[in-house]
């Protein structure tokens, strides 16, 4: 017989039939035929398929290996994987996250502008005039100077971008 | 309820075109294919095509594919039939209809038309 | 395509009676088949989907089975009001067939 013109939706074109896919969570035991409907079945424990899909197999669900630096961030389903992210102080190295590489730290004269998550890495920005940072760190913003004169003191010693002005007391003039 | 409501009678000439409208209402316009067909006076049902109003997907039978251009306006759930090069023997009564279905045993059945419409008579004469 | 053939086209019966109509298919259809109700000037009705199941709000005497690629639609107990034709429809995949259809007479 000539095939069918075409599938509706959720249906493919096997041996001139229009067979149903199975629905995801499901995969394909047998075709259908002329006389018997597709035949589907539950994927396993730790198995999944997202899609209506014709696959023979369902897929295993990602293993968030803490060797790695991962870790489960959602617990797949039969219709969905399992999500990792990394542990703590740790971000995913590309968007399907299979490796963890530590966070960066913001060197000195450099300050955090944004902290990093368990799928991006520290952003540091240079500390602007006005503003400075002292240490290596993945959280520390760059931190303003010190404001001598509402202290009532004067600039001993410029700050830079790596160091805080020193203030002094000012000079008494002698009588 | 459920409703597919047709425009409304034509008189055309042998060789003009004509556009026959089925509003939906009672019911989601984008998860129901849309099925046109037609019944010539005194004589049976037959199947011109269909539309998917979600997708646009059509499909027609051979002896249309040429002539029918099925379409949708979701924003309006309204589904078109448009028939061109018409003929005498293009005189008939045209239906949309709904075909629904329903999932069981992992899959997604097919379960023909459900709901028609009123039907819109399309006379062609000179 | 799919053809249906559909018998008889046309018979005569009386109220009460049991009446009893096949659509063959040229192919195997599992079970995506229909049964349809027309009645003069009206748009068809669907009575039975899935070669079997019966739509909600038809009579108990309407009644749909199966056996390989031929297929039957029984009426009980014929009523006045079931005096119409009758259409079968494959929906397998397309084109979607219908079969010529069975004018139902009062005898």
């Known amino acids: 017989p000539e095939p069918p013109t075409a599938c509706r939706e959720k249906q493919y074109l096997i041996n001139s039939q229009c067979c149903s896919l199975c629905q995801p969570g499901q995969k394909l035991v047998s075709d259908c035929t002329e006389f018997t409907e597709t035949e589907c079945l539950p994927c396993g424990e730790s198995e999944f398929l997202d899609t209506w899909n014709r696959e023979t197999h369902c897929h295993q669900h990602k293993y968030c290996d803490p060797n790695l630096g991962l870790r489960v961030q959602q617990k797949g389903t039969s219709e969905t994987d399992t999500i990792c992210t990394c542990e703590e102080g740790w971000h995913c190295t590309s968007e399907a996250c299979e490796s963890c590489v530590l966070h960066r730290s913001c060197s000195p004269g450099f300050g955090v502008k944004q902290i990093a998550t368990g799928v991006s890495d520290t952003i540091c920005e240079p500390c602007p005039v006005g503003f400075f940072s002292n240490v290596s760190s993945a959280f520390e913003k760059c931190h303003p100077w010190t404001s001598c004169e509402t202290k009532d003191l004067v600039v001993q010693q410029a700050g830079t971008n790596k160091t805080d002005v020193v203030c002094g007391p000012q000079d008494r003039l002698r009588a | 309820q459920v409703q597919l409501v047709q425009s409304g009678a034509e008189v055309k000439k042998p060789g003009a075109s004509v556009k026959v409208s089925c509003k939906a209402s009672g019911y989601t316009f984008t998860d129901y294919y849309i099925h046109w067909v037609r019944q010539a006076p005194g004589q049976g049902l037959e199947w011109m095509g269909w539309?998917?109003?979600?997708?646009?997907?059509?499909s027609y039978a051979q002896k249309f594919q040429d002539r029918v251009t099925v379409t949708r306006d979701t924003s309006i759930n309204t589904a078109y039939m448009e028939l061109s090069r018409l003929k005498s023997d293009d005189t008939a009564v045209y239906y949309c209809?709904?075909?629904?279905?329903?999932?069981?045993?992992?899959?997604?059945?097919?379960?023909?038309?459900?709901?028609w419409g009123q039907g819109t008579t399309v006379t062609v004469s000179s | 395509d799919i053809q249906m053939t559909q018998s008889p086209s046309s018979l005569s019966a009386s109220v009460g009676d049991r009446v009893t109509i096949t659509c063959r298919a040229s192919?195997?259809?599992?079970?995506?088949l229909g049964w349809y109700q027309q009645k003069p000037g009206k748009a068809p009705k669907r009575l039975i989907y899935a070669a079997s199941s019966l739509d909600s709000g038809v009579p108990s005497r309407f009644s749909g089975s199966r056996s390989g690629s031929e297929f039957t639609l029984t009426i009980s107990s014929l009523q006045p009001e079931d005096f119409a034709t009758y259409y079968c429809l494959q929906y397998s995949g397309s084109p979607l067939t219908f079969g010529g259809g069975t004018k139902v007479e009062i005898k």
């Open positions: 209809a709904r075909e629904v279905g329903g999932y069981g045993s992992g899959t997604y059945r097919y379960y023909g038309m459900d709901v």
């Open positions: 539309i998917n109003p979600n997708s646009g997907d059509t």
């Open positions: 192919q195997g259809i599992r079970n995506e």
